[in-house]
Structures are given as C-alpha cells and as structure tokens.
C-alpha cells in the first residue's frame, strides 16, 4: 500500500513520541561520535518536516523516501569529515548505495567512554528537572554503543527507565529502590543488543533464508500447536521487520511490529495459548512480552514422523518436487517436538537431513540409502548433550568467576591472535552461561547454552571482523552460521602461534586496584591470565592455578598494607619474578 | 470450530462426471495432506488418494486416470473430480487430513461424507 | 501397494468381555498402523496411531501393540458404546495408504 508521503504515513502511525524517539535511535546509531545536541537538533527538524507532511502531504520534499530525507539530514552535519573519516564519503553517493555506506560504517565498538552512573539524588533532579531531555539522553546513549539494537524495543526499555525514575525518586530510599532497576535495565538491555546482533549478522551475512530457517525452528517450538501455515506467516512478517530494523528502516521496522503484535493477538486461537496475557498490555509492553512468551505445550496426537520423512518411498519425489516446502515442514515438525534442543541444533539436522536427501536422491536405490538419516542424527544430538553436561559440572565445581578463567585459558589457547580486552569481555560472557542456563531442568538447558553461546560468539564474530587476526576465527564465523559453536569448540591449541614476549609492564599493578569494584578487579585478574596464556600457551592448569592463586594473594596482602603502593612496587616485580619462574 | 465439510454429491448417470468439494475451517488446508476415503454402501473404507502440502497429488492404482484430485487454498477448499462413473463407485465420499503436510495417516479429522449415487 | 487383512471380519461378545481383532500386513509396515472405530451413519474416529499410541480423549481399555506385519487392537473391557465397526489403516511406506477390510463388532 503506497503513501504520497512515506514520512507522514509513518508520523500518523506511530504517533509523534514513538516518531522522534525513533529517528533519535536511527541517527545515534549512524552518527555514533556526535554529540546529543547534534541530534536532538537534527531530529526536531525531521519532526517539524513530518508535520508538515502531515497538514499536506503533496508538500515540497514529502514525496522523498525516509532513506533520502535521513540520509539528506545527517550530510548537513558540518564535521562530517573530520568526526567520521571516510564515512563522509557516503554523503556524495545516491541511494540506495548512500543508506548501505552508512550501514557499512556502523561501528560495533565506538570508541566511547563507558557510562558513568551519576549519584541517584543527581539523576533524580536531571530527571524532574527535564524527563523529556532525561529520557532522550538514554535513548541517545544506548543506541551510540549499540549500532544495531532492536529500536522498538529500545523505546520499550526507555519506558520501563522512565517508570524506575518516577517511582523510585519518590521513595524513602530512593538508591535502593532504583540501583537493582537500573542494573536488571543494563544487564538486559546487553543481552537484547546482542541477541540482535546475531539477528542481523544472520541476515547479513547468511541472507534472510538463513534468517528464516531460524525463525521457523524458533517459533515452531514457541507455538506448537500452530499450523505450518500460519507459523511460515509468523516468519515472514518477522523476517520483514527484522530486515527493516538490521537495515536502518526503524519507522518502518517499529510500524510492522505493531502490525504483528496486532495480527498475533487477533488470531492467538491459532497461535498459542500463552498470547493472552501479553494481548492485555499496552503496544511497546505487548510487543515485548510476545517476544519473550514461554513454549506452548505441545499438542497432543503426534505422530512419529519417520512415516513421512525416513520410511516413505516417496520422500525423494517429494523432496523434488517441493523442496523448500518439504524442508521448512521437516524444520517445523521436527521443532515443534523438540522444545528441548537448541535451535542451532534444530538447524544442524534440517541440515544433515538435506545433504543426506541430496545425496540419496541421486542414488541407485534412494531409499535404502536414506533410512537410516535419522540415527546418523545421534551423534549431532549428543555433542551438545555431552558440551552442556560437561560445562555444567564445571560449571558447580569452580563457580562462576573460576569457570569464566578456566574458559579464558581455554578460548586463549584456541585463538591467541585475538586481543585481549576482547578475550576477556567474550570468556567472561561465556560464562556466565553457567548461572543463566545450569540452574534450568534438563529440557531447558540446551536451548538455554546453545542459542546463548551462539550470541556471544557472535559478538566475538563482529569484533574479529573489524580487526581481523586469525584465519581459524573467520573460519569459524564464516563458514556456516549454525556450526559456529561445534567449530569453535573444536578448535584445540594453536600450535603455530608464536609466544608473546613477556612485557613486565603488562603485569605491573598500583594502587589504584584496591579502589576498584570486584568486578573490575576480576577483569584485571581476567587480563593477566590472558597475557599468562599468550606468553606460555603450553602452561599446565596447574602452573596457571599457581600463579592466579599468587596473584590474588599478592593483591589481596598490598591492599591491606598501609602504604599500599609501596607494597606494589615491592612486591610486584617478585610477583612477576616468581611467576615467570613458575611457568619455565 | 476445527471442521471439514463435503458437498457436491447426489444422482449422477455411468459414464457421466461430478466435482465434490471439500471445504475446511478453522484451519488452513495448505499445511496438510488432504485425502479422500470412500465407502460403499455397507462395505469397508477404500482411500482414493491425496494431495500434500507440496501440491503433489498421489492416488490408489484402481483410481489412476479417472479421479483428479486439486485444491485452491484461497478458498481453504479441496476438491475430487470423478470422471466415467460407474455404478460401483456408488458410496459416501469422505474427505480426511493428514497428520501434517506429507503424511499419509492416520486421519484425526474426518468430513461427514457426501454420498455419490452412480444410475441410469 | 501392500495389503492389510484384518480379521475376524465379524465378531459377537458380551458387555465386560477382552476383545482382540488382528490386522496383517503382506509387508513390513515399520510401526506405521492405526485403528478406527465406525458407527452407522457417522465417519470413522481414530483410537490408535504407531499401533500403540492411543488418541487423546479415547478411553484407556483401547490399546494396540506389534509392529512389522502383525499388529492387535485390544479391548479390555467391552462397554455397550464400543459395538461398532473397526478398520486399521496402514501408512508411511509411500505417499499411498491402505485400509483393512473392517471387523464388525455385534452384541452376542
């Protein structure tokens, strides 16, 4: 359905608010060196454009695409050049090739300060004193560092900060009812940008089949008791709207999304059970919560479908005929009896189970050549069985912040070409796999470690290609999409890395360790053993064991001295001696 | 309300041609196997064959060349062209849905049938 | 095509009575064998899927049991709605399926 004017159909679809907050996201996530200013200046021009879009829609200008008047505003941005380097170079392009320079640009780690909490009482008064600067400053802030968050979802975050505030600054204790929101708000607003990351990464990288094969397995196992038609509807308006947002199109991406909230709640009878809680909320509230929705149980009479897809002599003629058909069925059957697997899993046997049919349906005898695919999915089936099995002892054996280091050591000697910062961030992540997905029954468990580990490989992924180091890293990450966490877990010691020369000012430490939250001092101590490993990747754990154990001590002995960084000065260089001793 | 419901029978002379329909609600037709079972007058079930989610269309070997079996899934409808009719095709029509879009049983949900009187 | 005999064709029993009807296959059929029960006037409903999984909603005297060629529909205890006419199908081979030839199940 076509609009005279794109900006003001979407201006009274989303309702001014929702618009703005919008085009915020879209210009903080393009220009992400730019001050808030900048883009609170630019955005109340494309707002008070829209308007008069609205009044007339034949006006000068309101006939342009969103891509051409965006792209048309952020080229007025007089440092361009000198903020943004070649980025300014996009501006002398048309479109369609202008909007993908800029997509091409965004950057996954910008080189911005991390965000400093300021007091609460000083929150609070920003807060009261101006909510609508207070609130857009957020949005600004969060979409900069996070290029490819889901917008709509970020509006959806912006709301629940702005309830925290205006509850909680009229509480007695206003730290105490505010700090815990704040950092559920930070620790699921990382995990919902990373999860999107992988989103886009699948469809920009692997195509949107890739993208779609995904969400047939996904939402086969959410809505089991959806038919095949209605959930590869499902997928194809998710597919457009995740298209739309991973492209930069956030009006367009955050109008469709409401038009799928809609459309599920209207038809939950065909859906899913579980859809009528979420229906009762308010839009961005509603959006969320389908998003998130808990398995439907499965329905009852299913049959075994080796009948259909192993036992039939017929499978070779159907698989001919209609072969995208044939395989997004076989994905959603076999989903949607498998709330227990991963979705990378559900993936590897749509897989296994094409290449099995390929290579049968050209033999002599097809079907004695494909009878037994479904034991040769066995092996597949155990491999994260056995990976999560293992992980999770490990896991209630060390607690968390030794099975993150055992992980350190273990991705470091894999992959010892990659930074430093970015093992520790990536391992510490991995991680915390442990507390997220251990404690869950059996049936949750591989899901849960899985399709996680596949999002934070993926982060290793993003960063690896700005600064690529290792082969076996683009290797794993380029290859195949669903076999990125099989690869990565193959990977053994890199026997041709050449050891990084021991520097002493890489393990030389102040005072100002003692200062430092547990967190932070975890992260040092995360660094070290990283360098550990890079200068002697044959360490033993034990050696490695020894010489962390020396480190905490030594830490912890300087921080209780009353001349602390005289104690570190002393004590570090036999620290670093003894450690180097250790490790020979 | 889940259903399937079967028309287009009644009196129809040997040699002559009929189309029976079968139109599904409450579900969407393009996910399943749609089959067609008959069954003479007090004798047994007799499958005639299916269209599947793919739109391939198999049938038993008596039913070859004179039984079509088509769909539209803009109107949710399953149909059964009957070509050179004979006094023993004589029987109510059922239509049934396949277990999911390639499966050839067991038939859960069942037509009431339509009865098709082959005579001169 | 295989083919699927069922037998006996005709049996009468009491209210209370264990009823068997067996259904033969002239090839393997893996464990893809299910049975219908029929009342006049009405189309067939399914009772057992796999040759053991019983439908839900369908009382637990019903079971079925074996698998390859030799396959039983057993009630345990014969109820008076359960006089009716029994069909097994057999299916998954290939993209055709088969049905036997019916038991019909009469108050002795």
């Known amino acids: 359905d076509t609009h005279k004017s794109e900006v003001a159909h979407r201006f009274k679809d989303l309702g001014e608010e929702h618009f703005k907050g919008l085009v915020l996201v879209a210009f903080s996530q393009y220009l992400q060196q730019c001050p808030f200013e900048e883009h609170v200046k630019l955005v109340n021009e494309v707002t008070e454009f829209a308007k008069t879009c609205v009044a007339d829609e034949s006006a000068e200008n309101c006939d342009k695409s969103l891509h051409t008047l965006f792209g048309d505003k952020l080229c007025t941005v007089a440092t361009l050049r000198e903020t943004y380097g070649e980025m300014a170079d996009c501006c002398a392009k048309q479109e369609p090739e202008r909007n993908e320079c800029f997509l091409q640009h965004k950057d996954d780690n910008p080189n911005l300060p991390p965000l400093v909490r300021p007091e609460v009482d000083v929150m609070c008064t920003a807060f009261h004193d101006n909510e609508a600067t207070f609130l857009k400053k957020y949005l600004y802030e969060v979409a900069r560092r996070h290029p490819y968050f889901y917008a709509p979802e970020l509006l959806f975050f912006a709301a629940r900060y702005k309830a925290a505030f205006a509850e909680c600054c009229q509480a007695a204790d206003k730290a105490a009812c505010l700090l815990p929101k704040l950092d559920e708000l930070r620790d699921e607003g990382k995990a919902s940008s990373a999860k999107q990351r992988l989103k886009c990464a699948s469809l920009q990288k692997f195509g949107d089949r890739a993208f779609k094969a995904w969400a047939v397995a996904r939402l086969s196992q959410k809505f089991p008791k959806a038919e095949f038609a209605e959930v590869s509807k499902l997928v194809t308006d998710l597919t457009k709207v995740h298209t739309e947002c991973c492209h930069g199109d956030l009006l367009e991406c955050a109008d469709d999304r409401a038009d799928l909230a809609k459309y599920m709640c209207e038809n939950q009878d065909s859906i899913s059970s579980k859809l009528k809680e979420c229906c009762d909320k308010p839009l961005l509230e509603k959006s969320h919560c389908l998003a998130e929705v808990e398995n439907d149980e499965m329905p009852a009479d299913l049959p075994s479908l080796a009948a259909d897809y192993v036992e039939s002599k017929d499978v070779c003629k159907n698989y001919a005929e209609a072969k995208d058909v044939f395989l997004g069925m076989f994905l959603y059957e076999y989903a949607r009896r498998h709330p227990d697997y991963s979705v990378m899993l559900l993936l590897r046997l749509a897989k296994a189970y094409e290449a099995t049919l390929e290579k049968c349906c050209a033999a002599a005898d097809p079907h004695e050549c494909y009878a037994k695919v479904f034991d040769e999915f066995q092996p597949l089936v155990e491999e994260p069985q056995n990976l999560v099995k293992q992980n999770c002892e490990l896991f209630e054996q060390l607690g968390e912040y030794k099975f993150q280091n055992a992980l350190l050591v273990r991705y470091t000697k894999k992959v010892p070409q990659v930074s430093t910062p970015t093992l520790v961030e990536v391992s510490r992540n991995l991680g915390k796999v442990g507390a997220k997905c251990c404690k869950l029954p059996e049936a949750k468990r591989m899901p849960c470690a899985e399709d996680y580990l596949s999002v934070v490989l993926n982060r290793l992924c993003v960063l690896h290609e700005k600064t690529p180091v290792s082969e076996k890293v683009t290797k794993c990450c380029t290859e195949s999409l669903v076999n990125r966490r099989p690869c990565f877990s193959a990977l053994e010691l890199d026997e041709a890395y050449v050891p990084k020369a021991f520097n002493a000012e890489t393990f030389t430490f102040h005072a100002d360790m003692c200062t430092l939250s547990e967190k932070e001092k975890q992260v040092k101590k995360q660094t070290a053993l990283v360098e550990l490993v890079k200068h002697k990747p044959k360490a033993t754990k034990e050696q490695l064991k020894g010489v962390m154990d020396n480190f905490a001590a030594f830490v912890e002995k300087c921080c209780k001295a009353d001349d602390k960084e005289a104690c570190f000065a002393e004590e570090g260089p036999k620290f670093v001696a003894a450690s180097q001793a250790a490790l020979a | 309300e889940v259903q399937l419901v079967e028309s287009g029978g009644g009196l129809v002379q040997p040699g002559g041609s009929l189309r029976l329909s079968c139109a599904a609600s409450?579900?969407?037709?393009?996910?399943?196997?749609m089959n067609w079972v008959r069954q003479a007058p007090g004798k047994g079930l007799e499958w005639i064959g299916h269209?599947?989610?793919?739109?391939?269309?198999y049938y038993a070997t008596w039913a070859k060349g004179r039984f079509t079996i088509s769909r539209d899934n803009s109107k949710n409808t399953v149909y059964l062209q009957m070509n050179s009719l004979r006094a023993e095709d004589t029987a109510v029509y059922f239509c049934?849905?396949?277990?999911?879009?390639?499966?050839?049983?067991?038939?859960?949900?069942w037509g009431q049938g339509t009865l098709v009187t082959v005579s001169s | 095509a295989f083919e699927l005999t069922q037998s006996p064709s005709s049996l009468s029993a009491s209210v209370g009575d264990r009823v068997t009807i067996t259904c033969q296959a002239s090839?393997?059929?893996?464990?893809?064998l299910a049975w219908y029960q029929q009342k006049p006037g009405q189309p067939p409903k399914l009772l057992i899927y796999?040759?053991?999984d019983l439908t839900s909603g369908v009382p637990s005297r019903f079971s079925g049991s074996g698998s390859g060629t030799d396959f039983t529909l057993t009630i345990s205890s014969l109820q008076p709605e359960d006089f009716a006419t029994y069909y097994c199908?057999?299916?998954?081979?290939?993209?055709?399926?088969?049905f036997g030839g019916g038991t019909k199940l009469t108050v002795l």
């Open positions: 796999d040759a053991s």
């Open positions: 090839e393997s059929i893996n464990s893809r």
């Open positions: 049934a849905r396949g277990a999911g879009g390639f499966s050839t049983g067991p038939f859960k949900l």
């Open positions: 199908q057999g299916y998954g081979g290939s993209s055709t399926t088969t």
């Open positions: 269209i599947n989610a793919g739109d391939i269309a």
């Open positions: 409450g579900f969407s037709l393009s996910s399943y196997a």
